[in-house]
Amino acid sequence: DVERTTCPPEKEVHEIDESLIFYKKRELEACVDAALLAAQMDRVDAIPFTYEQLDVLKHKLDELYPQGYPESVIRHLGHLFLKMSPEDIRKWNVTSLETLKALLKVSKGHEMSAQVATLIDRVVVGRGQLDKDTVDTLTAFCPGCLCSLSPERLSSVPPSVIGAVRPQDLDTCGPRQLDVLYPKARLAFQNMSGSEYFVKIRPFLGGAPTEDVKALSQQNVSMDLATFMKLRREAVLPLTVAEVQKLLGPHVEGLKVEEQHSPVRDWILKQRQDDLDTLGLGLQGGIPNGYLILDLSVREALS
């Protein structure tokens, strides 16, 4: 903490300007009025403060706004944003996309993924849902940031907005996020023709259930192996050899390359070796001939 001292009369600050770069830390602490700083935040980013001086300014704002900064201050934080922790940001209420854009620009090139994720979260909460304008802002200024949101936040995306999401925006999404986004995409694109539909739905398929994957296998989509490898393990395991062959089309040869990786490896273990042999790829590890397969998932129907 910066120690408290009295401000010398000649150092009294009446406006935020470049003269402040010559103030020592304790002079800034003593002489800058927090309310004045807040009122003139738009000037701060133009002044080449050291990181140490920025620490003092942040401390002043923290004292003035212990419950979190107002958006009028947040909008003009500039490089002071680099000093914020996720805990600080969690206290904010942000509704303006201009504020979001400004801070995303500042964070570029800095290791601030946690802060950015928290900021986006606050914007979604502040705006009530992840609307098209917010998604457009994220895709333009922070590719991949969509996937920093929790599944709970992503659930507020209206299906109508899904069309604005690009494949690269989903690269870092995990299964739980795709579980939320996939059904929305399926609803959003359902009026498209088969081939156009597949192009649109492909980036979201990591959230698809088995029956959707089976249906795709009937549509000559020739799924690329990268997409196949991103499918849920649980969605792939029930597929037959014939269904996988139809699904991948000419890309089926790639199974050999991915033989040791999930979900291909797990799928191979569930297939009859005879069936795997029909692919002519030399895939090994299937169930030997003569073995009985008991599907325990249907045990209730048998009892």
Epitope: L187, G207, P209, E211, E234, S297, E300
Partner: antibody
Framework: QVQLQESGPGLVKPSETLSLTCTVS????????WSWVRQPPGKGLEWIGY???????NSNPSLKSRVIISVDTSKNQFSLKLSSVTAADTAVYYC????????????????WGRGTLVTVSS | EIVMTQSPATLSVSPGERATLSCRAS??????LAWYQQKPGQAPRLLIY???TRATGIPARFSGSGSGTEFTLTISSLQSEDFAVYYC?????????FGQGTRLEIK
């Protein structure tokens, strides 16, 4: 073939929580989306919400603040909890399977449970 | 939300005759419409999806038509087992919504 069976108390007191479970037999819960739909006596159908086996849900905004849908893949079951019930929540509650095929791309229901009547009364 | 309105509320038709049931959406639902049949004490049964495609096992006397906001379910020659309540459902957007139903009764 796949069958659905709803279970739970037939009588719930006002302001309490209605709890129902749907057991999926004859197939895996992992392959589809699963919904709850209700029908007040003598009235039409109302979609409550769906769940995916991973736990991802979506529910009707008119009920969202009171609805929790959960899943137990080990038991091949999914459940509905509806809090702060009133007499207006008296209905036959159905669990249903969303057809889940891209070939027909839709959110409609090709398989239903028989339904269970839940009465809200003190 | 999209409001689905069915008409008439009750339709009286003699066996062997044609029945025409209507369903109107408050905004376009494209062809994302399903029809269900419900008999007393039973769960609904899927008849039609995609506005005009018959579900598995549904007799050819059931047909659906329409797109956008106006839809029709036609039963060409009524059998005794067809007297029931019929519901339309849109799945163009969430929340999924149903019509209030049309009761088809014997004249």
């Amino acid at each position: 073939q796949v069958q659905l069976q709803e279970s739970g108390p037939g009588l719930v007191k006002p302001s309490e929580t209605l709890s129902l479970t749907c057991t999926v037999s004859g197939g895996s819960i992992q392959n589809y989306y699963w919904s709850w739909v209700r029908q007040p006596p003598g009235k039409g159908l109302e979609w409550i919400g769906y769940i995916f086996y991973s736990g991802s849900t979506n529910s009707n905004p008119s009920l969202k603040s009171r609805v929790i849908i959960s899943v137990d893949t080990s038991k091949n079951q999914f459940s509905l909890k509806l809090s702060s019930v009133t007499a207006a929540d008296t209905a036959v509650y159905y669990c249903a399977r969303e057809v889940g095929r891209i070939a027909v791309a839709g959110w409609f229901f090709d398989l239903w449970g028989r339904g269970t009547l839940v009465t809200v009364s003190s | 939300e999209i409001v689905m309105t069915q008409s008439p509320a009750t339709l009286s038709v003699s066996p062997g005759e044609r029945a025409t049931l209507s369903c109107r959406a408050s905004q376009s639902v494209n062809s994302n419409l399903a029809w269900y049949q419900q008999k007393p004490g039973q769960a609904p049964r899927l008849l039609i999806y995609g506005a005009s495609t018959r579900a598995t096992g549904i007799p050819a006397r059931f047909s659906g038509s329409g797109s956008g906001t106006e839809f029709t379910l036609t039963i060409s020659s009524l059998q005794s087992e067809d007297f029931a309540v019929y519901y339309c459902q849109q799945y163009n957007n969430w929340p999924l919504t149903f019509g209030q139903g049309t009761r088809l009764e014997i004249k």
